[in-house]
């Protein structure tokens, strides 16, 4: 790391080190030999989240309902607003600037991980012994019915999309 001319939380201006403004405040005027750095609090709906020498605060993010967004955490003078998506939707990026509908898992696939506000549904193919006959964002793969436990026999084998069909056992005459 290269050497720095000033302490932490200071910046160099006119060959002198001045204090940075604390989070939640913006720079009004640099320090001089006789005066300290002048800072002002950010206004309503504005923020700065680091020690800084910014002359303007950043605007809080707007969670646009038309894009499926809602406020997860209201911003302060030191933090930005955090958006998330409405129920059934998830963010398209880490910044969560828009939302898309949760994906459904097609027949033959089950839900491995239910979607959240920031991640999509994760599907997995139903393994042998399991099936899913619906398109769903919630349903896991279901195990085939066990005919034996019902004193029945398999009349039709199951697939990844269908359950087995059970029937009565043939009686000896």
């Amino acid at each position: 790391e290269p050497p720095t001319a000033c302490r932490e939380k200071q910046y160099l201006i006119n060959s002198q080190c001045c204090s940075l403004c604390q989070p939640g405040q913006k720079l009004v005027s640099d320090c001089t030999e006789f005066t300290e750095t002048e800072c002002l609090p950010c206004g309503e709906s504005e923020f700065l989240d680091t020690w800084n020498r910014e002359t303007h605060c950043h605007q809080h993010k707007y969670c646009d309902p038309n894009l499926g967004l809602r406020v997860q955490q209201k911003g302060t003078s030191e933090t930005d607003t955090i958006c998330t998506c409405e129920e059934g939707w998830h963010c398209t990026s880490e910044a969560c600037e828009s939302c898309v509908l949760h994906r459904s898992c097609s027949p033959g696939f089950g839900v491995k991980q239910i979607a959240t506000g920031v991640s999509d549904t994760i599907c997995e193919p139903c393994p042998v012994g399991f099936f899913s006959n619906v398109s769903s964002a919630f349903e896991k793969c279901h195990p085939w019915t066990s005919c034996e436990t019902k004193d029945l026999v398999v009349q039709q084998a199951g697939t990844n999309k269908t359950d087995v069909v059970c029937g009565p056992q043939d009686r000896l005459r």
Partner: antibody, heavy 126, light 107 residues
Framework: QVQLVQSGAEVKKPGASVKVSCKAS????????MHWVRKAPGQGLEWMGW????????NYAQKFQGRVTMTRDTSISTAYMELNRLRSDDTAVYYC???????????????????WGQGTLVTVSS | DIQMTQSPSSVSASVGDRVTITCRAS??????LAWYQEKPGKAPNLLIY???TLQSGVPSRFSGSGSGTDFTLTISSLQPEDFATYYC?????????FGGGTKVEIK
């Protein structure tokens, strides 16, 4: 009362490394930058760099960049200065020195040393 | 880096004399200057900071003045314990730099 107690004298061969410790007592260790200053025989005082014991942040003089490492252990209020690839002209008394309190300074770096360790003589000789 | 030039490099004086040491910075450092006293085998001792503020416990015969590039340390009436080497140090920006020192010797 404030005290900075340094480790004892060291004799090293050229190319070796030395690590000097500085144990602080009598004040809040994390509230003040710690600097290292050296004085070679017949020479003046030379600033080597600082460590902020609170954040662990460091700033080294260009001359020592890549050769010096300053660390601290806040659990025992001790700062360390390690100098690598020693040369004969590194023979000097090495001092730790306490700065003004964090937040004291608004303009300038205003690093004035009100308390010093007793010094550690490092001799580099083949 | 800011160069600090002290003069004279040595001065011979007697007890009771007024001694003046000057320090010049290669660029303006406002009032960010300190003076230290160093005795053989001892760590330096802070005398004055921000060019003219006397450190607690330092006798009032020591005084400092100046701003910008030119600074002065004055010992109004030299005492036997004042025979030592004196250093100025700029505290405007890093790297901190010291003057070459002024040795005050007994005449």
């Amino acid at each position: 009362q404030v005290q900075l107690v340094q480790s004892g004298a060291e004799v090293k061969k050229p190319g070796a490394s030395v690590k000097v410790s500085c144990k602080a007592s009598g004040y809040t260790f994390t509230g003040y930058y710690m600097h290292w200053v050296r004085k070679a025989p017949g020479q003046g005082l030379e600033w080597m760099g600082w460590i902020n014991p609170d954040s662990g942040g460091t700033n080294y003089a260009q001359k020592f960049q890549g050769r010096v490492t300053m660390t601290r252990d806040t659990s025992i209020s001790t700062a360390y200065m390690e100098l690598n690839r020693l040369r004969s002209d590194d023979t000097a008394v090495y001092y730790c020195a306490r700065d003004q309190p964090l937040g004291y300074c608004t303009n300038g770096v205003c690093s004035y040393f009100d308390y010093w360790g007793q010094g550690t003589l490092v001799t580099v000789s083949s | 880096d800011i160069q600090m030039t002290q003069s004279p490099s040595s001065v011979s004086a007697s007890v009771g004399d007024r001694v003046t040491i000057t320090c010049r910075a290669s660029q303006g450092i406002y009032s960010w200057l300190a003076w230290y006293q160093e005795k053989p085998g001892k760590a330096p001792n802070l005398l004055i900071y921000t060019a003219s503020t006397l450190q607690s416990g330092v006798p009032s015969r020591f005084s400092g003045s100046g701003s910008g590039t030119d600074f002065t340390l004055t010992i109004s009436s030299l005492q036997p314990e004042d025979f030592a080497t004196y250093y100025c140090q700029q505290a405007n920006i890093f790297p901190l730099t010291f003057g070459g020192g002024t040795k005050v010797e007994i005449k």
